[in-house]
């Protein structure tokens, strides 16, 4: 006799208004009498509709939460698993039950903002900027909302960057406990003449940090051939262990690059008689603190003052 189990009931994908953080929830299946003492597990698969691969979760819970790209639709499927001790060691699964979440198609794609860029400056404040949609009426204006785990609900930007009295960006500071978790943004718009398509963005703040450039550069030459360069980590909340540096050294007409995770470096001179010996440096958050980052601006150039020319004797 074939053992059968029903799929979960009421499987659905729910949008609680958190700009892409969705809830997938379901109810237990109707179970025949002989399996009522059994442990039920649920195999959940979900993805954005343009993705080739499913994320798979095995859980005993009745809800699962994750972040999605709301620019695209979402689909999920779930089935019940009966524990093997209930089924004489055989694997018993229900049929799949499916759910989907369709994106709003209000407003044409041309009304959606373009070139959304966000930078977390020195791990202190976030600046996002955008350009208006390709074809929008002159009365169109945009509004930015954001959410991350720890906020009760999505918040609107309170400090817009403006051009011609239109919102073209937003500055956010005091983002407490907002790194190392998904940060969700929605930019929607309004016009009296047409609906505006919303745009969704998700990232983690530590991956878009642009530090200040290193400062207090110093260069010296020891034994006439060993170049020693030092600099200070920029001020602010980024721990010194989180920086990686790129250094450009210029010796007369020759330049070369080097890299280090420390805030000093020793090199050999390429030519003993070089007259010009200078360097500059920039920094970025390293792989131990983030998956990605943005290079700082270059520091000012620092040159060795110790060389006084052939007539100095």
């Amino acid at each position: 006799l074939e053992i059968k189990v029903n799929p979960p009931q009421d499987f659905e994908i729910l949008d609680p208004g958190l700009l892409g953080y969705l809830y997938l929830q379901w109810k237990p299946p109707v179970v025949i009498e002989k399996f009522k003492g059994c442990t039920l597990e649920y195999e959940l698969k979900y993805r954005n509709v343009d993705s080739d691969s499913w994320k798979t979760i095995i859980t005993r819970n009745l809800i699962y939460k994750d972040g999605f790209d709301l620019n695209k639709g979402i689909e999920g499927k779930i089935r019940t698993h009966l524990s093997e001790h209930c089924t004489n060691g055989s694997e018993v699964q229900s049929p799949w039950i499916e759910a989907s979440y369709g994106i709003s198609d209000e407003g044409s794609l041309e009304t959606k903002i373009q070139d959304m860029k966000c930078i977390y400056y020195n791990w202190q404040y976030l600046v996002c900027s955008w350009k208006p949609g390709k074809t929008v009426y002159s009365d169109t204006n945009y509004t930015m909302f954001f959410w991350y785990e720890g906020l009760d609900h999505a918040l609107q930007c309170a400090d817009y960057l403006q051009h011609d009295e239109k919102n073209v960006g937003c500055k956010l500071s005091n983002l407490d406990s907002s790194d190392y978790k998904d940060f969700f943004i929605c930019v929607n718009g309004s016009s009296k003449l047409e609906p505006i398509r919303s745009s969704y963005t998700v990232f983690q703040l530590q991956n878009i940090v642009k530090p200040l450039p290193p400062e207090f550069l110093h260069i010296s030459v020891e034994n006439s051939i060993d170049i020693r360069m030092k600099w200070s980590t920029p001020g602010g909340p980024i721990p010194p262990r989180c920086y990686t540096y790129e250094i450009v050294i210029r010796e007369d007409d020759i330049s070369w690059e080097s890299a280090t995770d420390k805030n000093d470096m020793k090199l050999k001179r390429r030519a003993n008689e070089s007259e010009d010996l200078c360097f500059f440096v920039r920094c970025k958050v390293n792989i131990y603190c983030a998956d990605d980052g943005i290079w700082s601006e270059w520091s000012e150039e620092e040159c060795w003052e110790g060389y006084t020319g052939p007539d100095s004797k």
């Epitope: 609680p16 809830y23 399996f35």
Partner: antibody, heavy 122, light 107 residues
């Protein structure tokens, strides 16, 4: 404390419309399916409609199918019942009730509102 | 639709009595059966779910049993506040149905 408070009942003529509301508090609204159950004067309980937590699933009794629409606004913690083409036999006290499930799928109505009276009469 | 039939339709009893109300389903509903109590002018109150599970806060003198098509609600020792109408409800189908009710009156 779980609370359900119905409103929107009243006197309406046959063929008319009415929208009932049920304001919920004291629980995570989106996690629960919700039902409407009615009771005609001096009669027993009759289940009317059910909606799942996210609103994706709706079910109706045959007696109201095509005339009544159940909906919910999870941002407002509110359940609705839009009643169109009302008939004299729809006269009843309408209760909203929260649906819960046992771990093996047994569905039951564990909290009820106090009800709102709908009278359909000319 | 699954039909639910309760018996008796009404019943007289005294405080301290043991009372049993039965409910029969028109087809097997496993143990997907709930019992509710309703007092005049009040909303129904859940007593028993899944045939035999006592709802939180309900006195232990109430108990439920049965499976398949035949179910019983038992009140082991009637208290004055127990005089009310009792309804069974099947929850197997996505279209739940109630029994017609059993009115429990003071003898």
């Amino acid at each position: 404390e779980v609370q359900l408070l119905e409103s929107g009942g009243g006197l309406v003529q046959p063929g008319g419309s009415l929208r009932l509301s049920c304001a919920a508090s004291g629980f995570t609204f989106y996690s629960y399916g919700m039902s409407w159950v009615r009771q005609a004067p001096g009669k027993g309980l009759e289940w009317v409609s059910y909606i799942s937590g996210g609103g994706s699933y709706t079910y109706y009794a045959d007696s109201v199918k095509g005339r009544f629409t159940i909906s919910r606004d999870n941002s407002k913690n509110t359940l609705y019942l839009q009643m169109n083409s009302l008939r004299a036999e729809d006269t009843a006290v309408y209760y909203c009730a929260r649906g819960s499930y046992s771990h093996y799928g047994a569905h039951y109505l564990d909290y009820w509102g106090q009800g709102t009276l709908v009278t359909v009469s000319s | 639709d699954i039909q639910m039939t309760q018996s008796p339709s009404s019943l007289s009893a005294s405080v301290g009595d043991r009372v049993t109300i039965t409910c029969r389903a028109s087809q097997s509903i496993s143990s997907y059966l709930n019992w509710y109590q309703q007092k005049p002018g009040k909303a129904p109150k859940l007593l028993i779910y899944a045939a035999s599970s006592l709802q939180s806060g309900v006195p232990s003198r109430f108990s439920g049993s049965g499976s398949g098509t035949d179910f019983t609600l038992t009140i082991s020792s009637l208290q004055p506040e127990d005089f009310a109408t009792y309804y069974c409800q099947q929850a197997l189908s996505s279209l739940p149905t109630f029994g017609q009710g059993t009115k429990l009156e003071i003898k």
